[in-house]
């Protein structure tokens, strides 16, 4: 998968790749932070969230956000069998009925209140990359990421391999 | 069906290198991070690394850092392990094998190679 | 490095039986653990992974639970072919690691 411009249209399949089953596979509460260890915290403002990339004061409370992981199948596919179809999925929640969601056409990473199922624009496809850090790439626009940018999370073209590793789309996850 | 069918077994002298192959049929081969395990014998698994043939970067464990390179060849659907500087503790079992989610390790190793036997002796 | 440190190192028991096979964690690895069987001279085969969720292709009588540093193996009901070795591997962060095995041996 890798959203890379070589694997396009094995990436791309995402587009039509159905949730296996309506339950995560596992879910747990943890800390995002950014590769250079900025926090992302979510501020309620004028009855809308926020979300903000910043240093946190000493001793300060990291926000947590509920992270739920699905497997996403392709439809049929060259194979025949689904062999290339499991990718890991994963949304993200910060506060009850809230879920990040892409939106590609501003490139931006919004806080949206919905109900379930959950649009495709609240599932990421989770890399995991070097150093322990992962990186979530749009459902919904292969080959673009959530990254930082300017102290605010938004969405980030990647389109060679080697970009990949660049530090802004790497996040890390802490359950402490 | 997804299959890995690895190099066949070595000897080598203490202080030489080996180099074991990986080749991989269907599915899309640069959709999936390849992983190299080895087991001495009578002993558990230990993992040594992975390489995305789709961009050919690699992480290697900390014990191999200095001693493995692990490449691909995207043309023919082939990963690659090489180790240098054997010692008789090198002496294993040698698994590639492709993780159940793409570019993720958490849902762990669904397909293996069927192993390739590296005896190290002078 | 996370340590994972499985046990019993090996069990006796009889066809019928249930067997459970357990793996801790050095530190909290959420459900990102996976388990296998290894047959003699083959390569190991996965059977549950995050924890819980079965492999397409295994046995029901195989089930997994646990998370953050506790898991466990449960074979409900031991088969002629479920003699073997198992498992477990922590696929929540560098370096990967597997815990020591655990040898079913028929009583």
């Known amino acids: 998968a890798f959203g890379i411009s070589g694997v396009q249209k094995y990436t791309r399949a995402l587009h039509d790749s159905s949730i296996t089953g309506i339950s995560p596979i596992t879910e747990y509460l943890a800390s995002l932070s950014t590769y250079n260890d900025q926090s992302i915290t979510f501020a309620l403002e004028d009855e809308s969230y926020e979300i903000y990339v910043e240093d946190l004061k000493k001793d300060e409370k990291k926000d947590k956000v509920l992270l739920s992981y699905y497997e996403s199948q392709h439809p049929s596919n060259e194979s025949g069998d689904g062999v290339d179809g499991k990718m890991l999925m994963v949304t993200l929640s910060p506060t009850k009925d809230f879920w990040l969601h892409a939106n590609n056409k501003e490139h931006s990473v919004e806080l949206h209140k919905c109900e379930k199922p959950l649009p495709d624009q609240a599932f990421f496809v989770l890399h995991n990359m070097h150093s322990n850090c992962v990186s979530f790439e749009c459902k919904t626009d292969p080959g673009v990421f959530i990254g930082v940018k300017d102290n605010h999370l938004a969405l980030i073209k990647v389109d060679s391999s080697e970009n990949l590793c660049t530090e802004n789309i790497l996040f890390k996850l802490s359950e402490t | 069906q997804v299959q890995l069918v690895q190099s066949g077994a070595e000897v080598k002298k203490p202080g030489a290198s080996v180099k074991v192959s990986c080749k991989a049929s269907?599915?899309?081969?640069?959709?999936?991070?390849m992983y190299w395990m080895r087991q001495a014998p009578g002993q558990g698994l230990e993992w040594m690394g992975w390489?995305?043939?789709?961009?050919?970067?690699?992480n290697y464990a900390q014990k191999f850092q200095d001693r493995v390179t692990m490449t691909r060849d995207t043309s023919i659907s082939t990963a690659y392990m090489e180790l240098s500087r054997l010692r008789s503790d090198d002496t294993a079992v040698y698994y590639c094998?492709?993780?159940?989610?793409?570019?993720?390790?958490?849902?762990?190793?669904?397909?293996w190679g069927q192993g390739t036997l590296v005896t190290v002796s002078s | 490095d996370i340590q994972m440190t499985q046990s019993p190192s090996s069990v006796s028991a009889s066809v019928g039986d249930r067997v459970t096979i357990t793996c801790r964690a050095s530190q909290g690895i959420t459900s990102w653990l996976a388990w296998y069987q290894q047959k003699p001279g083959k390569a190991p085969n996965l059977l549950i992974y995050?924890?819980?969720s079965l492999q397409s292709g295994v046995p029901s009588r195989f089930s997994g639970s646990g998370s953050g540093t506790d898991f466990t193996l449960t074979i409900s009901s031991l088969q002629p072919e479920d003699f073997t070795t198992y498992y477990c591997?922590?696929?929540?962060?560098?370096?990967?690691?597997f815990g020591g095995g655990t040898k079913v041996e028929i009583k």
């Open positions: 390489i995305n043939p789709n961009s050919g970067g690699t």
């Open positions: 094998a492709r993780g159940r989610y793409g570019s993720s390790w958490y849902g762990g190793f669904e397909y």
């Open positions: 269907g599915y899309t081969f640069t959709g999936h991070y």
């Open positions: 591997q922590q696929a929540y962060s560098l370096p990967l690691t």
């Open positions: 995050a924890a819980a």
